[in-house]
Interface confidence: low
């Protein structure tokens, strides 16, 4: 029974620059107590874990990424906020277990934010919207 699919997720997820995206990964019964993670990088063995659950349903947030496990529904949800073009990459929904972890790839693509009227005007004034994002980004450094 080694070929049984233990975890599934969307093949691709699309987000808007400066927006947020949500990925839902579904796992089979029996994995409720295991740690779930979200990692970045096309190569499975070398991907960088961005955020990991604590074994409970408590949401864990790290920088712009959060993860929350719903053990009853057997889904864990990853949210990426304040998206940047550079966030486009191959990611993995994963479950930590003895031996080899279980994982499924998710391709994340980022579309440029629609150009607003204020952005096309000659005035380079920073609007509140821009300031909010800038403050959030500054907090990350």
């Amino acid at each position: 029974y080694s070929i049984v699919t233990q975890i599934t997720g969307p093949t691709t997820v699309n987000g808007l620059e400066r927006g947020s995206l949500t990925v839902q990964c579904v796992y089979r019964s029996g994995w409720e107590t295991y740690l779930k993670w979200w990692c970045r990088g096309a190569i499975w063995r070398d991907c960088k874990i961005l955020v990991k659950t604590s074994g409970s349903e408590q949401e864990v947030k790290r920088d712009r990424v959060s993860i929350k496990d719903n053990q009853k529904n057997r889904t864990f949800t990853v949210t990426m906020e304040d998206l940047m073009k550079t966030d486009a990459d191959t990611y993995w929904c994963g479950i930590e277990k003895t031996g080899n972890d279980l994982g499924v790839t998710v391709q994340v693509t980022i579309d440029p934010a629609p150009v607003t009227q204020e952005e096309t005007s000659s005035s380079p004034t920073l609007t509140g919207h821009h300031l909010d994002n800038r403050h959030k980004l500054l907090k990350l450094s």
């Epitope: 029974y1 233990q6 089979r28 019964s29 409720e32 107590t33 057997r74 279980l102």
Partner: antibody, heavy 122, light 111 residues
């Protein structure tokens, strides 16, 4: 030899708590889950919940949430089930059982403890 | 919760004859092409012992006279030929979804 050795029978008063232990030997404790099952005299089996000694994560049957706390001590390869606010209908035999943690393969509870009898009496 | 209904509640079978125990689930316990159904035997004063897992696979050291079949919602455990040592309670269990649930049990005796 794989063994799950449970603590002895308990006679307890209503409203108190009791902690049942399940000591594992003969295998790598953190590589398998420990499940807990309740059996009232002459009755069927009820699944209480499961703990993953590797991660410390636990999952409870909704019916036993608040009544039961599952923990595991890696250093002594022992799993524990605490029952709180004991009532007469908590009187039962409680079993711990090992189940395969590598769910890439189908599993069932393959090794069981001998059971711990808990009697709630005033 | 997923409910498992076992029948009959008790059964008396002559030595050498066939015993058949049924288990019906309130919804399908199949997933990924596998039936998540187990069968346990419990003798008096002892813990349960797994006989069959994934509907039809015998557990380690389980004699060939025990066999399981079925898929979806209907499952059965067959014991043939019946031996004296088979006097026990038998339970089905589903592990398709939590909380895992057991059938009410079937008491098997010698006729």
């Amino acid at each position: 030899e794989i063994q799950l050795q449970q603590s002895g029978a308990e006679l307890v008063r209503p409203g108190t708590s009791v902690k049942v232990s399940c000591k594992a030997s003969g295998y790598a404790f953190t590589n398998y889950l420990i499940e807990w099952v309740k059996q009232r005299p002459g009755q069927g089996l009820e699944w209480i919940g499961v703990i993953n000694p590797g991660s410390g994560g636990s999952y409870y049957n909704e019916k036993f949430k608040g009544k039961t706390t599952l923990t595991a001590d890696k250093s002594s390869s022992t799993a524990y089930m605490q029952l709180s606010s004991l009532a007469f209908d908590d009187s039962a035999v409680y079993f711990c059982a090992r189940s395969e943690s590598n769910y890439s393969y189908y599993y069932a509870m393959d090794y069981w403890g001998q059971g711990t009898s808990v009697i709630v009496s005033s | 919760d997923l409910v498992l209904t076992q029948s009959p509640a008790s059964l008396a079978v002559s030595l050498g004859q066939r015993a058949t125990i049924s288990c019906r689930a309130s919804e399908s316990v199949d997933n990924y092409g596998i039936s998540f159904m187990n069968w346990f035997q419990q003798k008096s004063g002892q813990p349960p012992k797994v006989l069959i897992y994934a509907a039809s696979n015998r557990g380690s050291g389980v004699p060939a006279r025990f066999s399981g079949s079925g898929s979806g919602t209907d499952f059965s455990l067959n014991i043939h030929p019946m031996e004296e040592d088979d006097t026990a309670m038998y339970f089905c269990q589903q592990t398709k979804e939590v909380p895992y649930t057991f059938g009410g049990g079937t008491k098997l005796e010698i006729k």
